[in-house]
Interface confidence: low
């Protein structure tokens, strides 16, 4: 960081005095200060000398020394006061331009720090400041009007008390410009419009801005419409409104309507589409498949999209069976409006129970009539398995019944030892039954199949297992014969364990 000599933050001298400011840095250094007369500059490598042998009030200001080569961008500063008894102010600029809500610095620098206690800011010709003018003073920089407003665009003077009288600076003109942040704000209502031929319609295009200088127009397809304009001013904004009233719409009124507004900052445009139809309509659709399969215990949301004009007069979800006569709970039915003419209706079916499989229908009604959309919900179940020992045509037979959905596949295993479930190491024999007999297969119900395994001799130290599986899961039943002999006996002499 460069160093200034003399090494004081402020220096107070009288007019006509000689002032020498020396700045030393590691590399080359540069001075920056208020534009004022009589300074001479002498640079010698890493030092730079700013000097005058005739200081005037105009030399009052902050002088900053920087080292351009310093990557940290360090600087040092000294403030010089040239206290002229006749001139308490050094005004650096006579016009200040800011945008609304910015701070406005009026650069009147005090030439004598002793005078700070008696300073004030006034409007020219001694007029007081406007109410709510919030300002602060710095002897080094001048008066700052905080968050300047357009109405504060005035001519100001800085006042100092010298020997009991007020001494004014030359005037400073403050220009506070309104911020036109962009093109006018626009609204076009409605965002979409549908009417039956012969009905009335209204389209309203409105634009607003902080500045009155803007244009707004409404166009149909590519034709600019001649519509009387209503103008208003409220909330500090200018508003212009165009209203298109159509008593009896016809097909030629349909199409794209654009509301366009422009000012010096740019142009805004927003569009809507107007549809004219011959008669009322009601369309139901779903992005989902109308045939749904869900695992028992899981949840499902059924969604129907409705496009309708005029609006719906009624709608509901109905369970059409085949199980209980329960109806969907209203709290599980939800309706959301995407826009004026499109709605989504959702039926939530959490933790589905066996009795909730079947047909669900969504019905809706408007002046165009009734429409319905029906979903078919089938529940998936993992297989349930049971095995019994019986005689069929005199032969000992193991009979396996498996029920689930989708239809289960059946595999028989014979393994050594007594076990609840055959593992690979114990397996002696495996039989796949590719075509088990279907005992029952009704819509929305489980499918029950039966597989037979004819066993001439039941081995007493072995286990027979029936396994069934489908896409949901698997189930099994192990049959353990308990017998003294090697031959088959009637079923009541055997035990089986599930």
């Amino acid at each position: 960081i460069p160093v200034i000599e003399p090494s004081v933050p402020e220096l107070v001298v009288k007019p006509g005095a000689t002032v020498t400011l020396r700045c030393v840095g590691n590399g080359s250094v540069e001075w920056d200060g208020p534009p004022s007369p009589h300074w001479t500059l002498y640079s010698d490598g890493s030092s730079s000398i700013l000097s005058t042998n005739n200081a005037t009030f105009q030399n009052t200001g902050t002088y900053r020394c920087t080292e351009p080569g310093d990557p940290l961008g360090g600087s040092a500063a000294i403030h010089l006061y040239v206290k002229d008894p006749a001139r308490p102010w050094n005004v650096l600029a006579q016009e200040v331009v800011v945008f609304e809500d910015q701070d406005a610095l009026l650069p009147c620098l005090l030439t004598d720090p002793v005078l700070e206690a008696g300073v004030s800011l006034v409007r020219v010709r001694g007029r007081p400041l406007m109410r709510h003018t919030n300002y602060s003073f710095s002897p080094w920089h001048g008066f700052t009007i905080h968050r300047a407003k357009f109405i504060q665009s005035q001519d100001y003077q800085c006042s100092a008390l010298m020997g009991g009288r007020k001494v004014m600076s030359i005037s400073i003109r403050l220009k506070v410009q309104k911020v036109i942040p962009g093109p006018p704000a626009l609204t076009l209502v409605p965002a979409e419009l549908v009417r039956i031929r012969g009905e009335a319609a209204q389209i309203v295009c409105s634009a607003s801005s902080v500045d009155v200088n803007f244009d707004v127009f409404l166009q149909h397809n590519n034709t600019k419409l001649a519509i009387p304009q209503q103008s208003d001013f409220h909330n500090n904004r200018y508003q212009k409104v165009l209203t298109l009233n159509l008593d009896q719409v016809d097909f030629q009124h349909a199409g794209n309507y654009s509301c366009v507004a422009s000012n010096v900052q740019g142009k805004h445009s927003t569009s809507m589409f107007f549809r004219v139809v011959e008669s009322a309509y009601l369309n139901l659709s779903s992005e989902q498949n109308l045939i749904q399969e869900v695992t028992v215990g899981e949840g499902l949301n059924l969604k129907v999209m409705v496009e309708a004009y005029p609006g719906l007069q009624g709608f509901n979800w109905t369970y059409l069976g085949p199980f209980s006569d329960h109806q969907p709970e209203p709290k599980l039915a939800n309706a959301t409006t995407k826009d004026t003419y499109r709605h989504t209706f959702t039926l939530s079916l959490p933790r589905l129970k066996p009795s909730e499989a079947g047909r669900y229908s969504f019905l809706a009604r408007n002046p165009g009539g009734w429409r319905a959309l029906t979903f078919e919900l089938t529940l998936r179940y993992p297989p349930e398995v049971s095995v019994i020992w019986t005689f069929i045509n005199g032969s000992g037979t193991l009979l396996c019944a498996a029920s689930g959905y989708p239809q289960p596949n059946v595999t028989w295993l014979q393994c050594s030892g007594h076990t609840d479930r055959c593992d690979e190491a114990q397996v002696l024999q495996v039989w796949d039954d590719p075509y088990p007999e279907v005992l029952s297969q009704e819509p929305f119900h489980k499918v029950t199949v039966q597989s037979l395994l004819t066993v001439e001799t039941l081995e007493h130290n072995q286990t027979y297992e029936c396994r069934a599986h489908n896409s949901v899961g698997s189930g099994s039943w192990a049959f353990i014969p308990i017998s003294a002999g090697a031959h088959t006996h009637p079923p009541d002499e055997f035990l089986f364990t599930p």
Partner: antibody, heavy 123, light 107 residues
């Protein structure tokens, strides 16, 4: 010099929300609309919406309406973009961009851009 | 929404070549079109605004032309540092939309 500095990369789970910040410096923050644009990996640029910092007025791309919220803090010259109900297809670099002003009466373009914030949505 | 279609989607040229990229708008956008250059891992940079105006600091080898629906970006003499993806963008109306991009490579 004029610059826009954005917050760091974010990793979010589907369904969560993300809030990206954009700090402006070197110009009058309230005098220019701030826009938000995103770019999915290997894809083109997609405009999300803009905000007028002076009034807080917003305009959103209909595609994002209901999920995106643009705000500003004029005291810190910072713009924010919050996107909710995130899904994997929201994985992208999100840019803030100042709308340019060349004294033209119409036509919009983006003359200053932030460095971008990578938002990854993954379960 | 106004659709912006750029062609070609990629292009290979030699240093010193004259390169032309076109952009077509689905409806009349007057002259409210801008062009951006984006290098990998960086934010886009404005090259041209209002169809033909060169943004501050952009080399004069870049130029833009067109109005209505058809626009062109031209690089009069391709330089190695011009390798990037170029995007057009319409500023006629909300929502602002961009072209799909043209990836420019050196032969």
């Amino acid at each position: 010099q004029i610059q826009l500095v954005q917050s760091g990369a974010e990793v979010k789970k589907p369904g969560a929300s993300v809030k990206v910040s954009c700090k402006a410096s070197g110009y009058s923050f309230t005098g220019y609309n701030m826009n938000w644009v995103r770019q999915a990996p290997g894809k083109s640029l997609e405009w999300i919406g803009d905000i007028n910092p002076y009034y807080g007025a917003t305009t959103y791309n209909q595609k994002f309406k209901g999920r995106v919220t643009l705000t500003v803090d004029t005291s810190t010259s910072t713009a924010y973009m919050e996107l909710s109900s995130l899904r994997s297809e929201d994985t992208a670099v999100y840019y803030c961009a100042r709308r340019g002003d060349y004294g033209d009466y119409e036509g919009w373009y983006f003359d200053v851009w932030g460095q971008g914030t990578m938002v990854t949505v993954s379960s | 929404d106004i659709q912006m279609t750029q062609s070609p989607s990629s292009l290979s040229a030699s240093v010193g070549d004259r390169v032309t990229i076109t952009c077509h708008a689905s409806q009349n956008i007057n002259v409210w079109l801008s062009w951006y250059q984006q290098k990998p891992g960086n934010a886009p940079k404005l090259l041209i605004y209002k169809a033909s105006n060169l943004h501050t600091g952009v080399p004069s080898r870049f130029s833009g032309s067109g109005s209505g629906t058809d626009f062109t970006l031209t690089i009069s003499s391709l330089q190695p540092e011009d390798i990037a993806t170029y995007y057009c963008q319409q500023g006629q109306s909300y929502p602002y939309t961009f072209g799909g991009g043209t990836k420019l490579e050196i032969k």
